[in-house]
Amino acid sequence: YDFTNCDFEKIKAAYLSTISKDLITYMSGTKSTEFNNTVSCSNRPHCLTEIQSLTFNPTAGCASLAKEMFAMKTKAALAIWCPGYSETQINATQAMKKRRKRKVTTNKCLEQVSQLQGLWRRFNRPLLKQQ
């Protein structure tokens, strides 16, 4: 999906009002210096591309974050403020339902959410280019 045509300011507002708090809740009890950020993003479409991929792609040691509150709110924000996003996600959602597993917060998931926080912070930088 090409995130170029999203309403970035609306997504930023959704992040600041709720998603950021959910990320903090998920990371509660973890020191902010515990994990090194190894990925970043260039402009706002790039940030959303990486946020979407990191939030919804299973990775080694962290099978799924998709059912977490911050992930569901991220998905909702993208669906509302990125034209055509919902249609591109139908097949992915159906596949995810088949794979659904018990939620387990591993250290790898905490590290992944720490990376997500960094990507969201970068997305919100005032000087970051729209595209």
Epitope: T38, V39, S42, H46, L54, T59, A60, E111, Q115
Partner: antibody, heavy 117, light 108 residues
Framework: QVQLQESGPGLVKPSETLSLTCTVS?????????WSWIRQPPGKGLEWIGY???????SYNPSLKSRVTISVDTSKNQFSLKLSSVTAADTAVYYC??????????WGQGTLVTVSS | EIVLTQSPATLSLSPGERATLSCRAS??????LAWYQQKPGQAPRLLIY???SRATGIPARFSGSGSGTDFTLTISSLEPEDFAVYYC??????????FGQGTKVEIK
Amino acid sequence: QVQLQESGPGLVKPSETLSLTCTVSGYSISSGYGWSWIRQPPGKGLEWIGYISYYGSISYNPSLKSRVTISVDTSKNQFSLKLSSVTAADTAVYYCARTNLLYFDSWGQGTLVTVSS
Amino acid sequence: EIVLTQSPATLSLSPGERATLSCRASQSVSNNLAWYQQKPGQAPRLLIYDASSRATGIPARFSGSGSGTDFTLTISSLEPEDFAVYYCQQYSDWPQYTFGQGTKVEIK
């Protein structure tokens, strides 16, 4: 300390597919960062080809996108480049590099690929 | 596509002298700029990122400055091992990251 090493054929015929592999040691490619390819034609400047992140997102240089595939084999701690329909203009030293998806902090030593019949 | 123009193409200096290399972007890249050093037959090495932050292990004689469209890499006092080609790279314009054409710093 992370080390990267490119490998693959040094000579490829025009219209064929160039295939290179980068073997990473000292760091698990599924643990973090992005893994990138960059090339440098003889005596010229650098050109970014693309990257694959540790969580699977892929990004390519638009000028090469139609011909490029980057993939990863976590079991071997390797990532690969395929460039199809090559011409003499694809003759270059090809580097693999670790990236934070912005800039490139560790590089392989490079491998020269010549496109010639 | 953002074009990076480096100047001069070649800089002839003696060890101990100060080197000032320029990189100009065709449009603003904020501070999203890196500098690399490349010696003959070797891979590039990251020197500076975010326009002015030194990469790990880079000596303090290397410094970067600038924002927007005009950037400078300064080597305060050239050591023999500093004679090489230097490239700038912008990462403001994903997915079109681009490099400058390079500045060669040679021994006078």
